[in-house]
């Protein structure tokens, strides 16, 4: 079953290479188990950046080596991606799956274009 997912069109990463955005899914009821996946689309290639399955009301838990962190409130997931560099600029798509209870619902956002600008190296100081 299809589900509406909203996310901002554009986000600019900060000077430390961190970008945050909200992914909101519109469900007709309250799920108990939700899976959120961030996908990156660049040059028609889609790769998985990170994913987390969480129980409603609990924290999102990404893998220890994940570049993503997140929190949830209701049907809103606040996602943060760290360690980004200019070459990581691209379209980051939020995919939400309601895993339990059945039936299974899935929605994919239109994507958030994240722009990353590498900081200028500091000039040598005498």
């Amino acid at each position: 079953k299809a589900m509406h997912v909203a996310q901002p069109a554009v986000v600019l990463a900060n000077s430390r290479g961190t970008a945050s955005f909200v992914c909101e899914y519109a469900s007709p009821g309250k799920a108990t188990e939700v899976r959120v996946t961030v996908l990156r689309q660049a040059d028609s290639q889609v790769t998985e950046v990170c994913a987390a399955t969480y129980m409603m009301g609990n924290e999102l838990t990404f893998l220890d080596d994940s570049i993503c962190t997140g929190t949830s409130s209701g049907n809103q997931v606040n996602l943060t991606i760290q360690g980004l560099r200019a070459m990581d600029t691209g379209l980051y798509i939020c995919k939400v799956e309601l895993m339990y209870p059945p039936p299974y619902y899935m929605g994919i956002g239109n994507g958030t274009q994240i722009y990353v600008i590498d900081p200028e190296p500091c000039p040598d100081s005498d």
Partner: antibody, heavy 119, light 106 residues
Framework: DVQLQESGPGLVTPSQSLSLTCSVT?????????WNWIRQFPGNKLEWMGY???????NYNPFLKNRISITRDTSENQFFLKLNSVTTEDTATYYC????????????WGQGTSVTVSS | DIVLTQSPSSLSASLGGKVTITCKTS??????MAWYQHKPGKGPRLLIY???ILQPGIPSRFSGSGSGTDYSFSINNLEPEDIATYYC????????FGGGTMLEIK
């Protein structure tokens, strides 16, 4: 398309039990969703009574918890409402409906069955 | 229990006009709000869920908005078949309904 149909006696005597059946077609009640009973009092107020989930678990309105029971017959794809010790205050139109999740919007409803509690 | 205060309880409007119904909740419901249309002899019909999402098959004349404790529902370009009673429902904690708004056409 999913269809729900309520049935049961239109008249119940005070202090007796009210028993209603909801017959579901177009979807198996064990495949998913929660299967609810809602009633509408003569003044138009709607009250959620409780549900039985796809897995057989129940959730009831705390105001009715001591009097209500919702069960099912999976072979007939039906679920049932039993309300004990009825009074004239239980006179209402009773609806069955379906929702997703623990709590949710009801996407399919029956057309309702009117029940009068009177001696 | 979360209490829903729906207003007005009745309203009259002209064909082609616009009406707005509001629903105030006793606590933040995280946008878990649905709206129904109810006609005599039928079960309620789901129009909108999660505050603003139209149920498939529902005309875009119907719309919803809100957050926190304040929600609204509008019908644009009123048509004769819109004569009905409209209900709000929250599904953040239990399922509870507003008192209803009876809509008539002038």
């Amino acid at each position: 398309d999913v269809q729900l149909q309520e049935s049961g006696p239109g008249l119940v005597t005070p202090s007796q039990s009210l028993s209603l059946t909801c017959s579901v077609t177009g979807y198996s009640i064990t495949s998913g969703y929660s299967w609810n009973w809602i009633r509408q009092f003569p003044g138009n107020k709607l009250e959620w009574m409780g549900y039985i989930r796809f897995d057989g678990n129940n959730n009831y309105n705390p105001f009715l918890k001591n009097r209500i029971s919702i069960t099912r017959d999976t072979s007939e794809n039906q679920f049932f409402l039993k309300l004990n010790s009825v009074t004239t205050e239980d006179t209402a139109t009773y609806y069955c409906a379906r929702n997703y999740g623990t709590w949710g919007a009801m996407d399919f409803w029956g057309q309702g069955t009117s029940v009068t509690v009177s001696s | 229990d979360i209490v829903l205060t729906q207003s007005p309880s009745s309203l009259s409007a002209s064909l082609g006009g616009k009406v707005t119904i509001t629903c105030k909740t006793s606590q933040d419901i995280n946008k878990y709000m649905a709206w129904y249309q109810h006609k005599p002899g039928k079960g309620p019909r789901l129009l909108i869920y999660y505050t603003s999402i139209l149920q498939p098959g529902i005309p875009s004349r119907f719309s919803g908005s809100g957050s926190g404790t304040d929600y609204s529902f509008s019908i644009n370009n009123l048509e004769p078949e819109d004569i009905a009673t409209y209900y709000c429902q929250q599904y953040d904690n239990l399922n509870t309904f507003g008192g209803g708004t009876m809509l008539e056409i002038k």
